[in-house]
């Protein structure tokens, strides 16, 4: 696939326009229920979440329901159907399994209470793709400088298990970040399409943290970071074969 996608605001066959879903968390200024996030980990399923602060307050709105439309008839009528699964994605959520998910049509969703709409959003699945974290991070030593002060390492990882990389259904790009353990700011490397990357000029006497996250190429947003990989580089004196190093 090519092209870049961000956020949808309309359903193509609907004569109305709606505010778009922001894949990130939204601030909820009013106490009415609001959509907070919709996410697809692998372009085959997705879930949407909402706030429900009002039910903990004084105002009684009645049960919150999610309705969606994914295909309109030629008369432009909206066929709203209720959430197929309120359970699988946790509290205040709706989960759409693969039978309810296609990247080839626009979706609109709305929250209702007592028959009234309290929030309404539209998007396409590709815009809400946020992959699961990369897994199985490991590292190997590449080189140590002649001075014994710096070393280069190769970091490797695997794509998330649910990302169909082999058939090209998902093309992921990865961002690696690293820092010394006692630092607060992460150093960011340029995005890459491979599942390994060299990291150069690390200080031998320091311990480093490395993490990786991924996004679908040309669309969607970065997913969560992997678990942190800790890299401890041995002192020069621990190396026995000096001719291996430059």
């Amino acid at each position: 696939f090519s092209g870049s996608e961000a956020t949808a605001a309309i359903l193509s066959r609907a004569p109305w326009s709606l505010q778009s879903v922001n894949p990130g968390l939204k601030t909820n200024s009013s106490k009415e229920p609001k959509f907070t996030k919709c996410r697809s980990p692998e372009r085959e399923t997705f879930s949407c979440h909402w706030t429900d602060e009002v039910h903990h307050g004084t105002k009684n709105l009645g049960p919150i329901q999610l309705f969606y439309t994914r295909r309109n008839t030629q008369e432009w009528t909206q066929e709203w159907k209720e959430c197929p699964d309120y359970v699988s994605a946790g509290e205040n959520s709706c989960y759409f399994n693969s039978s309810f998910t296609s990247i080839w049509i626009p979706y609109c969703i709305k929250l209702t209470s007592n028959g009234g709409t309290v929030d309404e959003k539209c998007f396409s699945v590709d815009e809400i793709v946020q992959p699961d974290p990369p897994i199985a991070l490991n590292w190997t030593l590449l080189n140590v400088s002649l001075t014994g002060i710096h070393a280069d390492i190769q970091v490797r990882w695997e794509a998330p298990r649910n990302a169909d990389i082999q058939k090209g259904w998902m093309v992921l790009e990865y961002e690696l970040q690293y820092k010394e353990v006692n630092e607060t700011k992460w150093k960011m490397m340029d995005p890459i399409l491979t599942t390994s990357v060299p990291v150069y000029s690390l200080k031998v006497d320091k311990e480093y943290e490395v993490r990786v996250r991924s996004k679908q190429r040309n669309s969607g947003n970065y997913g969560e970071f992997s678990e942190v990989l800790y890299v401890t580089l041995p002192q020069m004196s621990q190396f026995t074969c000096e001719e291996d190093f430059y």
Epitope: S4, A8, P15, S20, S102, P106, S124, W169
Partner: antibody, heavy 115, light 108 residues
Framework: EVQLVESGGGLVKPGGSLRLSCAAS????????MDWVRQAPGKGLEWVAE??????????YYAESVKGRFTISRDDSKNTLYLQMNSLKTEDTAVYYC??????WGQGTLVTVSS | EIVLTQSPGTLSLSPGERATLSCTAT???????LDWYQQKPGQAPRLLIY???NLASGIPDRFSGSGSGTDFTLTISRLEPEDFAVYYC?????????FGGGTKVEIK
């Protein structure tokens, strides 16, 4: 009433280029997801490309058979969809249909690639 | 990609008869994302049925669709003269959108 009118087809030599246009009316074009679908003479239908609305950042998708050679684009101010076809091959010979998310179709324009 | 195979290739029937057209997918397709089109000679395809069983605008109720998983069916209960045409199934579920090869319904 939705109307889609294609133009720009014709005879072109292999390796040549052609630009198809589709004039749209009867719906809010700027909000629409638009596709090109083609049909080789006496054959079935083949999806070619899709372009989404401005709200979707005009995201584009292509069939593997045309990726890197064809470019779908749109001009919302003119209610017009385009298909720029480069490096044409004989197997690209077909009637090209402009469609509104494959629900409404134009009458098509014939592209013949032959030496 | 998901390949759709339509059978039979040609169906020879008389007006008033029942027509049953089959569409088989190489992998499972959600019923929400399977459509049928009708195409007459020299004309563009026309959406007939969407989401397996829903009639598109202006389509008479002698047309009906059914199926799930990998097997889908278009049925014309009583063929009218204007129904003789080529019919295509179309999926847009997981892979790129694909069409079946078509079934020609011709007058016997």
């Amino acid at each position: 009433e939705v109307q889609l009118v294609e133009s720009g087809g014709g005879l072109v030599k292999p390796g040549g280029s052609l630009r198809l246009s589709c004039a749209a009316s009867g719906f809010t074009f700027s909000d629409a997801w638009m596709d090109w679908v083609r049909q080789a003479p006496g054959k079935g239908l083949e999806w070619v490309a899709e372009i989404r609305s401005k709200a979707n950042y005009h995201a584009t998708y292509y069939a593997e058979s045309v990726k890197g050679r064809f470019t779908i684009s749109r001009d919302d101010s003119k209610n017009t969809l385009y298909l720029q076809m480069n490096s044409l091959k004989t197997e690209d010979t077909a009637v090209y249909y402009c469609t509104l998310i494959r629900d409404y179709w134009g009458q098509g324009t014939l592209v013949t690639v032959s030496s | 990609e998901i390949v759709l195979t339509q059978s039979p290739g040609t169906l020879s029937l008389s007006p008033g008869e029942r027509a049953t057209l089959s569409c088989t997918a190489t992998s499972s397709v959600s019923s929400s994302y399977l459509d049928w089109y009708q195409q007459k000679p020299g004309q563009a395809p026309r959406l007939l049925i969407y989401s397996t069983s829903n009639l598109a605008s202006g389509i008479p109720d002698r047309f009906s669709g059914s199926g799930s998983g990998t097997d889908f069916t278009l049925t014309i209960s009583r063929l009218e003269p204007e129904d003789f045409a080529v019919y295509y199934c179309h999926q847009y579920h997981r892979s790129t959108p694909t069409f079946g090869g078509g079934t020609k319904v011709e007058i016997k």
